[in-house]
């Protein structure tokens, strides 16, 4: 565990940048900053979650522009922005800093916010190192800042993964060794038996796995029942003789302000009541003015610190502050090996060669996966396909209604009528046949094939 710290030094127009403040004719304003940390150095979608954490600064001093004056560096909030991280520090990360303007004029519905600048840096940074300085430009604006990552004891090291206690500690916990004088690092603990629980087991000799109170089993993964003390062996309470449950990550409830604690592998997670957020629900008195809804969530209510706010999350996000991304791709909606891309506002499938469609459901190369609608049949050849449509339909999938009479199929002045199963020709006197193609002799006999029984010349002839 540890804390990422960001110090903003200045924010103002860069060289050759905005000659005047953007606040003109907007009344008094003030700045605040939002920092977002994402693991890794890869290009990530802007709406992907701040998986390492996020933080909001306090509001800066109120600023009113002097008419026609050049824009100076703008007054900044006091203090550091701190983003606590629970697990190991990844070393490589993306740092996103947003500069927001809050307008304090007489706005309907309260203050208005707008994003002035956003900078993204991909960085390598070891925990415990010195402050790193940076200057970034976003449009006409220039942001100067420093940052560092520091571990919180007992964690030490460049990734905050080694555990250490001061040398004066009377007893080290499981797997801990006292720090050597004047050193930040500590001795590496012995390698325990493979699979020994990191939470409930420890070792003093390589290959062993000794259990904390309240845990048993060869790998210290079995909780000891406290309902009965009979027949139990192991470390016991001096008062009852019973095994004492070992300390868990939720012991003492690390969640402040009424948050409820739940254990996660190797750590804990706080579920915060409305009005509070942060790793331990320690950020309190939050209102919509603090912009607590991440990832484009809409904040409602919470006009003052005593009333709760609610975040209405956009599609793809959840959590009391819209801080958790819903992994809709886990449902594997893309067929035939398609790649699922969760864009936040929508899912997209990028289809493998030979497949297409919104979910890669169409096979481009043969008729196996291709549906021809309305009785059409798929014809393939040479690696290609096409739909041969039933009469009255057209288009690539035979979904479009075609006018069967458009081609004037009825010969010799016959009248064409569209029919649900095709077309019907009403022949002019003296002609018969499906398309009125056969002249009728005066004796009522056609010159070519005889009319089907029951059909007289002039009767409508249906052409299937």
């Amino acid at each position: 565990a540890g804390v990422f710290e960001l110090q903003i030094h200045s924010f103002g127009p860069g060289p050759g940048g905005a000659p005047r403040s953007p606040y003109s004719a907007r009344g008094p304003c003030r700045l605040f900053f939002r920092v977002c940390l994402k693991p890794g150095l890869s290009e990530e979608a802007a709406e992907s979650p701040c998986a390492l954490g996020a933080a909001l600064s306090a509001r800066g001093p109120v600023y009113t522009e002097q008419p026609e004056a050049p824009a100076p560096d703008l007054p900044l909030p006091n203090g550091l922005l701190q983003v606590p991280f629970r697990d190991a520090w990844p070393g490589t990360f993306s740092l996103i800093i947003e500069t927001w303007r809050e307008e304090l004029g007489d706005q309907i519905g309260g203050p208005a916010w707008s994003l002035l600048a956003r900078v993204t840096r991909r960085r390598r940074l070891a925990a415990g190192g010195p402050w790193a300085g940076d200057i970034q430009r976003a449009g006409a604006w220039e942001l100067r800042f420093s940052y560092r990552a520091r571990c919180e004891l007992p964690a030490v090291g460049t990734a905050c993964t080694r555990l250490c206690r001061p040398r004066s500690a009377s007893r080290c916990g499981p797997g801990l060794r006292p720090c050597a004088p004047l050193e930040d690092e500590c001795e590496a603990p012995p390698v325990c038996r493979a699979g020994c629980s990191l939470e409930h087991g420890f070792c003093e000799q390589p290959g062993e796995c000794r259990c904390l109170e309240g845990w048993t089993g060869p790998l210290c993964m079995v909780p000891v029942s406290t309902s009965s003390c009979l027949g139990l062996r192991g470390p016991s309470s001096t008062t009852t003789g019973c095994l004492v449950p070992g300390p868990g990550p939720c012991d003492g409830n690390p969640c402040a302000n009424g948050g409820s604690c739940s254990e996660t592998p190797g750590s804990f997670e706080c579920t915060c009541p409305r009005g509070f957020y942060g790793l331990r629900c320690e950020v309190s008195g939050v209102t919509c003015a603090d912009g607590p809804c991440f990832n484009g969530g809409l904040c409602v209510g919470g006009a003052d610190p005593d009333s709760a706010y609610i975040c209405h999350c956009p599609p793809g996000f959840q959590g009391s502050n819209c801080e958790k991304r819903v992994d809709r791709c886990s449902l594997q909606p893309c067929r035939n090996g398609g790649l699922c891309l969760d864009l936040g506002h929508a899912l997209r499938c990028r289809c493998r060669a030979g497949f297409a469609g919104p979910r890669c459901e169409h096979d481009l190369n043969d008729c196996a996966g291709r549906a021809c609608a309305n009785g059409g049949t798929c014809v393939e050849g040479g690696g290609a396909h096409r739909c041969s449509c039933a009469l009255g339909f057209g288009g690539r999938d035979c979904r479009e209604r075609a006018d069967p009479c458009a081609a004037r199929p009825c010969a010799h002045g016959g009248r064409c009528y569209a029919h649900f199963s095709g077309l019907v020709c009403a022949c002019a006197p003296g002609y018969m046949g499906a398309r009125c193609e056969f002249p009728v002799h005066p004796d009522g006999v056609s010159a070519l094939p005889a009319a089907p029984p029951g059909l007289r010349p002039g009767d409508p002839q249906r052409y299937p």
Partner: antibody, heavy 119, light 107 residues
Framework: EVQLVESGGGLVKPGGSLRLSCAAS????????MSWVRQAPGKGLEWVGR??????????DYAAPVKGRFTISRDDSKNTLYLQMNSLKTEDTAVYYC??????????WGQGTLVTVSS | DIQMTQSPSSLSASVGDRVTITCQAS??????LNWYQQKPGKAPKLLIY???NLETGVPSRFSGSGSGTDFTFTISSLQPEDIATYYC?????????FGGGTKVEIK
Amino acid sequence: EVQLVESGGGLVKPGGSLRLSCAASGFTFSNTWMSWVRQAPGKGLEWVGRIKSKSDGGTTDYAAPVKGRFTISRDDSKNTLYLQMNSLKTEDTAVYYCTQYYWNSFDYWGQGTLVTVSS
Amino acid sequence: DIQMTQSPSSLSASVGDRVTITCQASQDISNYLNWYQQKPGKAPKLLIYDASNLETGVPSRFSGSGSGTDFTFTISSLQPEDIATYYCQQYDNLPLTFGGGTKVEIK
């Protein structure tokens, strides 16, 4: 990093033969459909043909002007794509590009190799 | 075969201009269309896939739209490095076919 490197181009007489190779790296070659695309000097792009991955049948498809004369093959153990060109004509003169066709697009291209058919 | 007709065949525009190229298919190809950029002496590069989706790493000034038979490719603000020939390509049916290309130059 995906890399495709063509080789084997050169000058050949009409009616002659030539074999182009494409060495692939930076991706799982055996899973990927591959294609050849050509470009005559000063002209546009023309698809020559493709070969599917073995898992998708390994079949080949060709454009009409080269069908029966050109053969595409692959050696997955060597991560190499081949284009065997027989009965070459002057109109086959072009830069030949080897392309990865994993998605329904020519995602990555080699630098190309020039084939000149002239007497 | 599906014919792809691109227009104009060439155009000249100033830096910062909005540039639009059209591509028309001889039959309905749904959104089964890609756009490529080819700079002089270089291999083509995929910019847009499935008619409107920007390939990873491609600047957002490039965009595509359309479905069926009519498609549009747009550069919202032309930059000097955009001097190239742009091609559309359909994958609805074999043979895979390209448009004739549009050469974009700076005034």
